[in-house]
């Protein structure tokens, strides 16, 4: 009967997945640079924050050279994963002092999403460990005040902009390895 | 287009062994994920094994672990399942297929019976 | 027993709109993985019909549409048609496999 017939190609590949996931974290870095600014203009932040339930920064300018692709993509859906869960909390429970922001945190949060959705895809595709490694979920309480949520608020965006950062950096890097 | 082709089924006693090859073309093999999935007759699908796209990640169906190699061969384009200790339960359509998975060979079926 | 749980037959008259389920657990559909659909002719090969819970290959009919929440996925097939009669397979990726999970298929019938 002949060879059998070959399947049409789907929407993407692995590769097409990546430049995705850094055109998706460019964007993403773009909304939170600016609604950082924004924070900034309406509650001007009064030194550094930070909240300990954040992932800390997973990597640094040193160990870009070192990346290697399944460490990368588990650690950055890990940490996206985390602050897509902060920013549902802001939202939920950032007060009446955030409300004014709501239609960028509701922006932001359905990027991330979208962002998460991509980079589940491009491991699939590539067949990766995809179950984050086992870490503490530290629950997150009501802000104490209307000044905790702002606060926390400077400490996710700050965070996520920090985050997202070295992810556009350590995804170019890795394109160059797939 | 894409093309997987399975090969090497037939039949074999319980307790035998056989070594499944599956040769694409059509896509760029090395950045792909591949499995082995299977299908008892008249059954559903069941999943086998996967190796990562340079097949430094393995894993197995309990049904299948410490039986069955999955491994990979990226200057060839070929995907191999060895199978050993075969039983009756083990017979069904074997099926290579590659990423999500997105495609999907026709098949080759291994038949487990004295 | 598959660990994604589908109705093991459906059925519609052509032009009609049919739904299959798919319910997992916390482990797979329930942490947060995508599902994908696949439709199986009659003696055929399986081929990708949804993935990423919404998204479809080139060449899929905008007919077919996928949705998740929760633990559980569904697939809508909307103006059946006598072509549609294949079996329906959900999938999603298993933490404790460390590889994709099936559903134990639908068998859809065209009256």
């Known amino acids: 009967p002949g060879p059998p017939a070959g399947s049409p190609r789907v929407s993407s590949d692995p590769r097409a997945d990546l430049d995705s996931a850094v055109l998706l974290t460019r964007s993403l870095l773009a909304d939170t640079r600016q609604l950082a600014a924004q924070m900034r203009d309406k509650f001007p932040a009064d030194g550094d924050h930070s909240l300990d339930s954040l992932p800390t920064l997973a990597m640094s300018a040193g160990t870009l050279g070192s990346l290697q692709l399944p460490g990368v993509l588990t650690r950055l859906r890990v940490d996206l994963m985390s602050y897509l869960r902060h920013v549902q909390w802001l939202r939920r429970a950032g007060g009446p002092s955030l409300k004014t922001l709501e239609p960028e945190l509701g922006a932001l949060q359905a990027r991330l999403e979208r962002l998460l959705r991509r980079l589940q895809l491009l491991m699939s595709r590539l067949a990766l460990p995809q179950a984050a490694p086992d870490q503490p979920v530290i629950p997150l309480g009501p802000p104490a005040s209307a000044w905790g949520s702002i606060r926390a608020a400077h400490a996710i965006l700050g965070g996520l902009h920090l985050t997202l950062d070295w992810a556009v950096r350590g995804l170019l890097l890795l394109k160059t390895r797939l | 287009e894409v093309q997987l082709l399975e090969s090497g089924g037939g039949l074999v006693q319980p307790g035998g062994s056989l070594r499944l090859s599956c040769a694409a073309s059509?896509?760029?093999?090395?950045?792909?994920?591949m499995h082995w999935v299977r299908q008892a007759p008249g059954k559903g699908l069941e999943w086998v094994s996967v190796?990562?796209?340079?097949?430094?990640?393995?894993y197995y169906a309990d049904s299948v672990k410490g039986r069955f190699t999955i491994s990979r061969d990226n200057s060839k384009n070929t995907l191999y399942l060895q199978m050993n200790s075969l039983r009756a339960e083990d017979t069904a359509v074997y099926y290579c297929a590659a990423g999500v998975p997105d495609y999907w060979g026709q098949g080759t079926l291994v038949t487990v019976s004295s | 027993q598959s660990v994604l749980t589908q109705p093991p037959s459906a059925s519609g008259t052509p032009g009609q709109r049919v739904t299959i389920s798919c319910t997992g657990s916390s482990s797979n559909i329930g942490a947060g993985y995508d599902v994908n659909w696949y439709q199986q002719l009659p003696g055929t090969a399986p081929k990708l019909l949804i993935y990423s819970n919404n998204e479809r290959p080139s060449g899929v009919p905008d007919r077919f549409s996928g949705s998740k929440s929760g633990t559980s996925a569904s697939l809508a097939i909307s103006g059946l048609r006598s072509e549609d009669e294949a079996d329906y397979y959900c999938a999603a990726w298993d933490d404790s496999l460390n590889g994709p999970v099936f559903g134990g298929g639908t068998k859809l019938t065209v009256l």
């Open positions: 059509g896509f760029t093999f090395s950045s792909y994920g």
């Open positions: 190796i990562s796209y340079d097949g430094s990640y393995k």
